[in-house]
Amino acid sequence: QLPPGKPEIFKCRSPNKETFTCWWRPGTDGGLPTNYSLTYHREGETLMHECPDYITGGPNSCHFGKQYTSMWRTYVMMVNATNQMGSSFSDELYVDVTYIVQPDPPLELTVEVKQPEDRKPYLWMKWSPPTLIDLKTGWFTLLYEIRLKPEKAAEWETHFAGQQTEFKILSLHPGQKYLVQVRCKPDHGYWSAWSPATFIQIPSDFIMNDEQKLISEEDLGGEQKLISEEDLHHHHHH
């Protein structure tokens, strides 16, 4: 029987800069029941506080609700593991909420095949930002990425959409059923999970064009750019 091994705070994430959660990995338990506590202080403060909520984030976590989350302060935190034989402390972790944002996936992904009379058909997709994110404050710039593939294909084709919430793709395989997903990330922070897949059946009479793909830079009424396959590699993130 031994004192517990050193725990490690391995991840802190915030969905929206208003709350955040940190998770730790226990060290070895030393063969005895072990209690964990997370303590923190904000840089410039002398008082230490203990985690306000060990429940919300699941096992080995600490959740900081709105009243405990400050965007403009760095949190200094550590985890203490204690059993009957002794204690051990994690390394201190410095957390700035601005840089740990991982939004929820975008919502309401809509995908349609558009077949205008005067132009080539294209796949049009539209989505909404995650609800928890308030883009009106200007605190957030969200960037989007789309991926799609035929249902039975192994490889995804990925497109960077910038700040747009609409996107067009021209080059698709006729008669195939496609899966489409979208994800987002703030300017500083982490990519969200991919949204649930939306399925779209491409009609058999869809005109294939291997040379070019059409990407909308503006909204649907705005200017459109033809981008060659070569240029498109700059937009790819596999």
Partner: antibody
Framework: EVQLVESGGGLVKPGGSLRLSCAAS????????MNWVRQAPGKGLEWVSS????????HYADSVKGRFTISRDNAKNSLYLQMNSLRDEDTAVYYC???????????WGQGTLVIVSS | DIQLTQSPSFLSASVGDRVTITCWAS??????LAWYQQKPGKAPKLLIY???TLQSGVPSRFSGSGSGTEFTLTISSLQPEDFATYFC?????????FGGGTKVEIK
């Protein structure tokens, strides 16, 4: 509605012991640090002790260090103060108070009177 | 330990008066100061925290200001229910300490 109710006060001789309790309701008790604050008759407020959410951080005023022990039972939504080696100067109304770490002592009980006298 | 000195200790005022209470800290405490109101036989009630943030449900005639070592509590227009004793408290470091109190009485 948040309620903190102290109990356990009374008359005790110098050198004696007493255990105060504070029962919390209407709050997620385990999410808050808790405190004991006392007020001698006609005097100001004196902070006595604080205990963090899982009891990993405990602090005492110098005047009670070594004599008083703060503890909590999150399963019972209860805070305790074990007071040993009581002195005349420990006579006071004892309040339990919730500490919102983002703010201050935002909820207080009604207090329980401890009289130390021979 | 950080000492808090409140001034004045007693204050006589009339309904409608503007009242200012000052709290000095013996060393810098940033903005970690709270103000409480206490009426006879009752528990203290939180008015202001982090020097200037009004606690929910507290009338807007109460305001707080200051940082470092000098802080003020202002009641813009004294109401009959405001006659009470007011305490400041520092939450910057242990031991947590309170000021000696300011009793606001009817003139």
């Amino acid at each position: 509605e948040v309620q903190l109710v102290e109990s356990g006060g009374g008359l005790v001789k110098p050198g004696g012991s007493l255990r105060l309790s504070c029962a919390a309701s209407g709050i997620t008790f385990s999410s808050y640090s808790m405190n004991w604050v006392r007020q001698a008759p006609g005097k100001g407020l004196e902070w006595v002790s604080s205990i963090s959410t899982r009891s990993s951080l405990i602090h005492y005023a110098d005047s009670v260090k070594g004599r008083f022990t703060i503890s909590r039972d999150n399963a019972k939504n209860s805070l305790y103060l074990q007071m040993n080696s009581l002195r005349d100067e420990d006579t006071a109304v004892y309040y339990c108070a919730r500490w919102d770490a983002a703010a201050a002592f935002d909820y207080w009980g009604q207090g329980t009177l401890v009289i130390v006298s021979s | 330990d950080i000492q808090l000195t409140q001034s004045p200790s007693f204050l006589s005022a009339s309904v409608g008066d503007r009242v200012t209470i000052t709290c000095w800290a013996s060393q810098g405490i940033s903005s970690y100061l709270a103000w409480y109101q206490q009426k006879p036989g009752k528990a203290p009630k939180l008015l202001i925290y982090v020097a200037s943030t009004l606690q929910s449900g507290v009338p807007s005639r109460f305001s707080g200001s200051g940082s470092g070592t000098e802080f003020t509590l202002t009641i813009s227009s004294l109401q009959p229910e405001d006659f009470a004793t007011y305490f400041c408290q520092q939450l910057n470091s242990y031991p947590l300490t309170f000021g000696g109190g300011t009793k606001v009485e009817i003139k």
